[in-house]
């Protein structure tokens, strides 16, 4: 057993670990060359070269020219060839393959289940607040406010179907007009794209993998945002979606039909229902303005109930509210009437974990949020690992060719449309665009699916989720049939319009370019991905919502200057790229602005310092816990983190580069923390860094 077990698997040729590493890794500075360190037992430990994938220099350094990070990586097969194996090896290989496939299915199942639980957790944490957003009817007549309400609610409940069903019931009960509901539906479309973006964050371990995964996930976001950017003003001006859906409803006579088959739910429900079950009606009741629902818990306690209709004496505001004059009386002060009241008799409790805990919704939500994110993260890592080991050589080539190759020459353009159909079909089968796009994200990350192919698949997924909604609408009761169908059709035509805007002409495939740009920035500054998520899905909608509460004049007064500034920046950016000659010298680049206004570098420095401080505190805790554990179990071989030393000691000690545990490619998960002091300064003062500008 080596004194530093984490370093045992240090690769002799570290360049193999990183794509596009052109030459050997930068050597260790002279001052460190002769130094060696001693471990706890006093034996000297040789200085070990830091693997590139864990080197701050290589990670932040941009790939060399001519090596496109968007090129799909070659998934080489380093294993023994089939022909070279003996029969025992072949059998073992087959069993190994079967085992991997079963494990892959298992982790995929857990992954989908954790997405379901994550949605429930979000509903427990923010569901009631989401319902309250809807109960503010006066604001929702403002299309911009409606849009951000749709975004916020869907982000909070992590389910566009929940927000859509609330909208449907509000329209059906005349609390909301179809016209006011359309922007909310658009917002729900945006909100649903957060799920796969969260999933992409889990792949932050490897920069190139993260670049692809994050771009693949955000292509969905950009498509939705850009579609709204064009179609919301168009809808506000012309009401084309409302008119078109009205025309469709009047042209075709729709009969009540069957709901879409819940294939995935059938498989996942038995497991997720053991974890948590929610009463989704509570959010709906809050949205409909039921004040009593605010005090109800979202956690379902009773799964089997019997409804008894009984006649009950109830007070009413005036005799006009009586059931009939014959069933109307007074007690001298209040007017009473007889009403049929459905009383629920509880028969059997639900069988989930939290059924007997008297914990508040928020506490259960936070517990589930944490656990589901951990499981999601774990499953993702395992799926990526398993796919990485399965998709090698011949298999990888076949799959990549199948997924990414276009049809022969005259029909090449049809490939994308087939991908749209495949995306729609797959989403229709799994009944959730979130599940489909989230499952696709790791595949984009490891390079099985290209961004160019992921884009039409995502667009198809958007269509698939609306066809599901149309079928669900057709299965709804008579009183809500028309409104639910019209809203589902609005959703459908909105996505169709979006596809017509941003897909048919390759030049207009702006979401791909924007997603790649964001992928590049996020690969370099990984914190930016989190910032993007919070800024676009939470802060911006909340700000717009707040301004909407203040009224139209305030919203316009604040919004117009911001929009004008953005347009100005975009125009200037276009001119800088296309025809800089017409611009004055000063405006040909962004250097006339302070660095922090056009580069993420200063922000990165601040965040790096902040996280290093946090990391040190965190490591200290880990180290104390570790020491305690060692004392308790009497284990002499276990090593505790070295990142928690006095600053004086830190200055004396030399910097030892350390390879993270082989199990993960994620630096955040490494067992040993590097000494921060000098290392951090070096990272910040690196010459190799190029300032990636935001603009």
């Amino acid at each position: 057993m080596a004194p530093w077990p984490e370093l045992e698997n240090a690769h002799p040729n570290p360049n193999k670990f990183i794509e596009g590493a052109s030459g050997p890794q930068s050597s260790i500075p002279d001052k460190d060359k002769g130094t060696s360190k001693t471990n706890d037992s006093g034996t000297p430990v040789a200085k070990i070269e830091l693997l590139p994938s864990y080197s701050a220099l290589v990670l932040i350094e941009e790939p060399p020219e001519g090596n496109d990070p968007w090129d799909l990586p070659e998934l080489q097969d380093n294993g023994i060839k089939w022909s070279e194996r003996d029969s025992k090896g072949k059998i073992l290989c087959i069993f190994q393959g079967i085992g991997k496939f079963i494990l892959l299915l298992g982790f995929l199942y857990l992954f989908v289940c954790s997405l379901d639980v994550l949605s429930s957790a979000f509903q427990l944490v923010g569901g009631k607040m989401a319902g309250q957003f809807f109960s503010n009817n006066s604001i929702m007549s403002n299309p911009v406010a409606g849009l951000v309400i749709g975004v916020l609610v869907t982000v909070m409940v992590q389910s566009s179907s929940t927000s859509s069903s609330i909208i449907v019931s509000m329209v059906a009960s005349s609390l909301l007009s179809v016209r006011a509901a359309i922007p909310i539906i658009m917002g729900a479309n945006i909100g649903t794209s957060i799920t796969n973006t969260i999933v992409a964050l889990m792949q932050a371990g490897d920069r190139n993998e993260f670049r692809r995964a994050f771009a693949g996930a955000t292509v969905h976001d950009f498509f939705n945002w850009l579609s709204v950017l064009v179609l919301l003003p168009l809808e506000a001006a012309t009401h084309y979606l409302e008119k078109l859906t009205n025309l469709v409803l009047e042209t075709f006579s729709f009969q009540n039909g069957e709901d879409a088959p819940d294939i995935l739910k059938v498989i996942t429900d038995p497991f997720t229902k053991l974890i948590i079950q929610l009463d989704k009606k509570v959010i709906q009741q809050i949205a409909m303005g039921d004040s009593e629902a605010q005090n109800k818990s979202l956690i379902k306690i009773w799964c089997k109930t019997i409804s008894n209709v009984i006649e009950e004496n109830v007070t009413v505001p005036s005799p006009d509210n009586c059931t009939s004059p014959s069933y109307c009386w007074t007690d001298g002060i209040q007017t009473w009437t007889i009403q049929n009241v459905t009383e629920k008799e509880n028969i059997a409790k639900c069988q989930h974990i939290f059924v007997n805990f008297s914990l508040p919704d928020l506490a259960v939500g936070i517990i589930l949020l944490t656990v589901s994110l951990l499981i999601l993260c774990g499953c993702l890592i395992m799926i990526v690992k398993l796919l990485g080991s399965v998709l090698r050589g011949q298999v990888a080539t076949v799959i990549k060719k199948t997924l990414n190759t276009d049809f022969p020459f005259p029909f090449a353009w049809l490939t994308g449309y087939l991908a749209i159909l495949v995306g729609a079909g797959m989403t229709f089968i799994v009944q959730s665009s979130s599940v489909f796009t989230s499952a696709m994200t790791p595949l984009i990350g490891i390079g099985v699916i290209s961004i160019e192919r992921a884009y039409p698949l995502t667009l198809g997924s958007n269509i698939g989720t609306t066809t599901t909604a149309i079928l669900a609408a057709l299965a709804s009761p008579g009183n809500t049939l028309r409104s639910s169908l019209q809203i589902a059709l609005c959703h459908f035509f909105f996505n169709i319009s979006g596809i017509l805007l941003w897909y048919p002409i390759p030049f207009t495939r702006l979401p791909i370019r924007l997603a790649k740009g964001l992928g590049n920035i996020s690969a370099k500054y990984r914190w930016f991905a989190v910032f993007y998520l919070i800024f676009f899905f939470l802060l911006t909608p909340l700000t717009v919502f707040g301004l909407s509460l203040a009224g139209w004049p305030v919203l316009v007064g604040v919004g117009v200057p911001i929009i004008l500034l953005i347009l100005l920046v975009l125009c200037l950016r276009m001119l800088q790229a296309r025809c800089p000659r017409i611009l004055p010298l000063k405006l040909r680049d962004w250097n006339f602005l302070p660095l922090w206004m056009h580069s993420l570098k200063p922000w990165d420095n601040i965040i790096s310092l902040a996280t290093s401080c946090f990391q040190r505190r965190c490591c200290c805790c880990c180290r104390v816990c570790c020491r305690v554990c060692c004392m308790v179990c009497g284990c002499k071989c276990c090593r505790c983190s070295k990142c928690c030393k006095n600053l004086e000691e830190e200055e004396k000690e030399q910097d030892v580069p350390v390879k993270a545990s082989g199990g993960f490619d994620n630096t955040a998960m490494s067992k040993e923390c590097q000494d921060e002091g000098k290392g951090q300064v070096e990272v910040l003062g690196m010459k190799a860094l190029s300032n990636t500008t935001v603009f």
Partner: antibody
């Protein structure tokens, strides 16, 4: 058992006010309405109004609106009925009666208070 | 206001007789009708509510019937203590109103 005890007889001059009290016992005071009904000599019963002691909510017969005020004191479980601007035709026996929960029938009555209005 | 008209205004009967008093409402009151008995110098006493429901402690010889606009109070076998004035009352709507009363006398 439920008991409603009213204040004694009153003789008032026209234009004056009278305040009749009704002390209750034997039940939860705040759960039932309390009605006031009057009966002029040799005449039928006439409803004046009602009060819900739980909230202080009141309802008055339009005929007496502006002249009648009903109050309740939960600390002593007593209700009061004040009739102002008395006229000779207000001479009557005034009864307090407990309303049955949820409807306007009156199950328990006080013994009555004779109010005589004469100059 | 809803008017209640009782008939007859006076009624003479003997002990053991079956007596019926009627009460007509000027509009539909459903079953929101109560019947009271009042003896001279005493406070009224509730007999029937909801047109047909006997109040606790009221003898079974008293019964009520009717709905809508016509109601009846029936005493199946008159007893000496039953000679008094009987009032019907509606509580369908405010203001609560009483009938003018039916005086039951010994023949």
């Amino acid at each position: 058992q439920v008991q409603l005890v009213q204040s004694g007889a009153e003789v008032k001059k026209p234009g004056a006010s009278v305040k009749v009290s009704c002390k209750t016992s034997g039940y939860t005071f705040t759960t039932n309405n309390m009605h006031w009904v009057r009966q002029a000599p040799g005449q039928g019963l006439e409803w004046i109004g009602a009060i819900y002691p739980g909230s202080g909510a009141t309802a008055y017969n339009q005929k007496f609106k502006g002249r009648v005020t009903m109050t309740a004191d939960t600390s002593t479980s007593t209700v009061y009925m004040e009739l102002s601007s008395l006229r000779s035709e207000d001479t009557a026996v005034y009864y307090c009666a407990r309303g049955m929960y949820g409807h306007g029938a009156m199950d328990y009555w006080g013994q009555g208070t004779l109010v005589t209005v004469s100059s | 206001d809803i008017q209640l008209t009782q008939s007859p205004s006076f009624l003479s009967a003997s002990v053991g007789d079956r007596v019926t008093i009627t009460c007509k409402a000027s509009q539909d009151v459903g079953t929101a009708v109560a019947w009271y008995q009042q003896k001279p110098g005493k406070a009224p006493k509730l007999l029937i509510y909801w047109a047909t429901t006997r109040h606790s402690g009221v003898p079974s010889r008293f019964s009520g019937s009717g709905s809508g606009t016509e109601f009846t109070l029936t005493i199946s076998s008159l007893q000496p203590e039953d000679f008094a004035t009987y009032y019907c009352q509606q509580y369908s709507s405010n203001p609560l109103t009483f009938g003018q009363g039916t005086k039951l006398e010994i023949k």
